[in-house]
């Protein structure tokens, strides 16, 4: 049986319904099964767990995403296998397996796969920062989202009116969500909001940063 | 040889009912999937029902569904097509045709002729 | 449903001639596509399957190619047993359906 699923990943916004287009070709025998199994990503395939079963007629979703799993067909005989997946959870994002076997059909080995990623919107950031918040001296702000699919891009923004930093004092890496802010001076001191970004939405975190003369660095 | 002879055809009343037959011989019929397939007066051709070598699985149109039955007799080697509430649109040479393992038609009768008119 | 449409609806050609005819489906059917030839009176016999293979004993001046959406079937050096008519199917999902076929006359 030739199997035929999409080339493309599947996107999935938390809680919303999955639909795991699964389309073969073959005259349906009384021997045809279905099964679909979900593989966690980074696991090898063989690691898979099966999640749904269709044969002799009848259907047998197993495991622990049993309550959520149908066909948008059954029985699957019509040549759509496509699996529905209900409320997705962040633990749904992985390779899904849709295997058709109708002997004497063994023109190919009946198996598509279907990688799933569960979008969700950034948690809220935890802010925090390390280093010298003395004047001269150096920190490092911190930004991290705990939850976010795909990975939230972070971005630092200063709040308020202020001098313009001079080139090069005030460098970001959107991906690690990291503000490296060097030779401090007493005006760098103020308010920085970070916020976490991605096609789902964005949250946000503030940390207040005080900059006092040599000996006398804190972050209130 | 691979063999399969329609029956059954006739002239019936809108409404009414019918029963075809195919007998089918030349090839092992309990392994194969089987379907009716009609060509209408204006030559144009329509699957009207398939089911599976043991008779698990049927499917049809929509343009039959809840009329047409389709089912098998494995040990006479027979297929059968019921057809009720039949309609002029029934009107066709009925084929009895044999699946390959995709669902393309190999082996073809030679067709039994249905007549629905008042 | 998948629609599939055959052009032209009649042709006409002289023996020894080359000719080919097109099937076009309303949506992707991969190679998911068979031919048929029906002559007067008789009932349809397959040609191709796949798009492309020919099952055993049909000569290999026919030839089916395409995918997706778009096929034709070509007929090399026309032979007198060739005239009649062709049809096209899908063998992809269910409803299976078939083409309102091509009339291939002797010019």
């Known amino acids: 049986v030739e199997v035929k699923v999409p080339t493309e990943p599947l996107s999935t916004p938390l809680g919303k319904t999955a639909e795991l287009t699964c389309t073969y070709s073959t005259s349906v025998g009384d021997s045809f099964a279905l099964e679909w199994s979900f593989v966690q990503p980074g696991k090898p395939i063989s690691e898979s767990h099966p999640i749904l079963y269709f044969t002799n007629g009848h259907l047998y979703p197993t495991g622990s995403k049993s309550k959520r799993v149908s066909l948008l067909q059954n029985p699957p005989t019509v040549g759509v296998a496509t699996l529905k997946l209900t409320d997705v959870h962040p633990s749904d994002t992985g390779t899904y397996l849709c295997q058709v076997n109708n002997p004497p059909d063994f023109y190919t080995n009946g198996l598509g796969l279907i990688n799933l990623t569960v979008l969700v919107p950034p948690s809220n950031p935890l802010c925090s920062q390390s280093g010298q918040t003395s004047v001269g001296g150096s920190t490092a702000l911190r930004c991290s989202s705990s939850e976010g699919a795909p990975k939230p891009v972070y971005n630092w923004v200063r709040l308020g009116t202020f001098p313009t930093p001079s080139p090069g004092s005030m460098v970001q890496d959107e991906v690690s969500g990291q503000l490296i802010l060097t030779n401090l001076s007493l005006t760098s001191s103020g308010t920085y909001r970070c916020v976490a970004t991605n096609q789902m939405g964005s949250a946000s975190c503030e940390l207040t940063l005080s900059v006092t003369e040599p000996s006398q660095g804190r972050v209130a | 040889e691979v063999q399969m002879v329609e029956s059954g055809g006739d002239l019936v009343k809108p409404g009414g009912s019918l029963k075809l037959s195919c007998a089918a011989s030349?090839?092992?019929?309990?392994?194969?999937?089987m379907s009716w397939v009609r060509q209408t007066p204006d030559k144009r051709l329509e699957w009207v029902a398939s089911i599976s070598d043991g008779g698990l699985y049927t499917h049809y149109p929509d343009s039959v569904k809840g009329r047409f039955t389709i089912s098998r007799d494995n040990g006479k080697s027979t297929l059968y097509l019921q057809m009720s509430s039949l309609r002029s649109e029934d009107t066709a040479i009925y084929y009895c045709?044999?699946?390959?393992?995709?669902?393309?038609?190999?082996?073809w009768g030679q067709g039994t002729t249905l007549t629905v008119s008042s | 449903d998948i629609q599939m449409t055959q052009s032209p609806a009649s042709l006409s050609a002289s023996v020894g001639e080359t000719v080919t005819m097109t099937c076009r489906a309303s949506e992707n059917i991969y190679s998911y596509l068979a031919w048929y030839q029906q002559k007067q009176g008789k009932s349809p016999q397959l040609l191709v399957f796949n798009a492309e293979t020919l099952p055993e004993g049909v000569p290999s001046r026919f030839s089916g190619t395409g995918s997706g959406t778009h096929f034709s079937l070509r007929i090399n050096s026309l032979q007198p047993e060739d005239f009649g008519s062709y049809y096209c199917?899908?063998?992809?999902?269910?409803?299976?359906?078939f083409g309102g076929g091509t009339k291939l006359e002797i010019k």
């Open positions: 045709a044999r699946q390959g393992v995709r669902p393309f038609f190999d082996y």
């Open positions: 199917q899908h063998h992809y999902v269910i409803p299976w359906t």
């Open positions: 030349g090839f092992t019929f309990s392994n194969s999937g």
